[in-house]
């Protein structure tokens, strides 16, 4: 099959790297700089992908595979392929249009990317919180109540400002 | 493919609960909030709430404070909405909307087909 | 608390230039992103414009969006009967509050 395939197409012969030149009688020609071709019969080369302002080059590119790029630092990689760079944030954060803002009171973001999220409801496993939630780090959840022995007290949030109801911890 | 799927229409008397259940596929549903948003006859869009189902947390809308409770079952990656004390002003049609992880003033880029709860004695 | 502001409807005939408008009350709704949903009888909302002017993939590019200090705005040229539908705008109080616009119906003439 491969040999009457090749009969009829001479450019199935063209491997990665090359491209198959109508203008040449159909000889494997090298892909020209800045461009590859990552499988073999290729009519023509990708351009490669160039790593340039936020983006910067991870791999370059070779006659067979394309560049590929990651962010400055500062930055981090969003999309397949790092196809965008989003602004880091400080833990305690998360970016909104304006930038990176604190995250509202009731939610957290332990990481430099991302969305600040809520802090665990413990009530929900039945236990109670043992240390209480900041901007950057998530309650811990100890005992219920029932459970702690006499004179241990297990940590009461403090209550909303103006945001929006959380639920009860 | 990303998809939420919202359980059926309710009939309901004054008084009384529902609950609405959406199940999400095609993503990781521990990952991103979910809103629930209503809208009555005619009316437009109004927030109930929102869970992060990877720990249950919940924000409920100051309108909505202890008669909205929303619930997750990561087994089925499944959310829930119960709301309790009926009154007729509740019908509406009730939506699920995933909101993506990018910023924290995103857009709602998937949404429930929507639930019909109609309050009636 | 952010009340955004949109006219209740908007008109025009096949092909012309339709803007809606979404207004905001006080403060700056350049602070938060503007989200525009489009929603047809009977169905769940469908993103139009995303993060002020931003458009999702199969949406025309006869749909713009745009964002000023106090108002952000969805523009349709070349009006099709099948953009007939209501609009909505949608930001955030907090990042945690969403907060929509009334809705306007575009009705095409």
């Known amino acids: 099959f491969e040999r009457t395939r090749s009969l009829q197409d001479p450019c199935s012969n063209c491997p990665a790297g090359t491209f198959c030149d109508n203008n040449r009688n159909q000889i494997c020609s090298p892909c020209p700089p800045n461009s590859f071709s990552s499988a073999g019969g290729q009519r023509t080369c990708d351009i490669c992908r160039q790593c340039k302002g936020v983006f910067r080059t991870r791999k370059e590119c070779s006659s067979t595979s394309n560049a590929e790029c990651d962010c400055t630092p500062g930055f981090h990689c969003l999309g397949a392929g790092c196809s965008m760079c989003e602004q880091d944030c400080k833990q305690g954060q998360e970016l909104t249009k304006k930038g990176c803002k604190d995250c509202c009171f009731g939610t957290f973001n332990d990481q430099k990317r991302g969305i600040c999220r809520p802090w665990t409801n413990c009530s929900l496993d039945g236990k109670s919180v043992l240390v209480n939630g900041t901007k950057e780090r998530d309650v811990v959840c100890g005992p219920s109540p029932a459970d702690l022995s006499p004179g241990a007290s297990s940590v009461t949030p403090p209550a909303p400002a103006r945001e929006p109801g959380h639920s009860p911890q | 493919e990303v998809q939420l799927v919202q359980s059926g229409a309710e009939v309901k008397k004054p008084g009384s609960s529902v609950k609405v259940s959406c199940k999400a596929s095609?993503?990781?549903?521990?990952?991103?909030?979910i809103y629930w948003v209503r809208q009555a006859p005619g009316q437009g869009l109004e927030w109930i709430g929102n869970?992060?189902?990877?720990?249950?947390?919940?924000f409920y809308g100051e309108k909505f404070m202890g008669r909205a409770t929303f619930t997750a079952d990561t087994s089925t990656s499944t959310a829930y909405m119960e709301l309790s004390s009926l009154r007729s002003e509740d019908t509406a049609v009730y939506y699920c909307?995933?909101?993506?992880?990018?910023?924290?003033?995103?857009?709602?880029?998937?949404w429930g087909q929507g639930t019909l709860v109609t309050v009636s004695s | 608390q952010v009340v955004l502001t949109q006219p209740p409807s908007a008109s025009g005939t096949p092909g012309q230039r339709v803007t809606i408008s979404c207004k905001l009350n006080?403060?700056?709704?350049?602070?938060?992103?503007v989200h525009w949903y489009q929603q047809l009888p009977g169905t769940a909302p469908k993103t139009m414009i995303y993060?002020?002017?931003k458009r999702p993939d199969g949406v025309p590019d006869r749909f713009s969006g745009s964002s000023s200090s106090n108002s952000a705005s969805l523009a349709i040229s070349g009006l099709q009967s099948e953009d007939e539908a209501d609009y909505y705008c949608?930001?955030?109080?907090?990042?945690?509050?969403?907060?929509f616009g009334g809705g306007t119906k575009l009705t095409v003439l």
């Open positions: 949608h930001s955030y109080d907090s990042t945690i509050t969403p907060v």
């Open positions: 909307a995933r909101r993506p992880d990018y910023s924290g003033d995103d857009y709602f880029d998937y």
């Open positions: 869970i992060w189902p990877g720990n249950g947390g919940t």
């Open positions: 993060r002020d002017d």
């Open positions: 095609g993503y990781t549903f521990t990952s991103y909030y």
């Open positions: 006080s403060g700056n709704i350049g602070s938060y992103y």
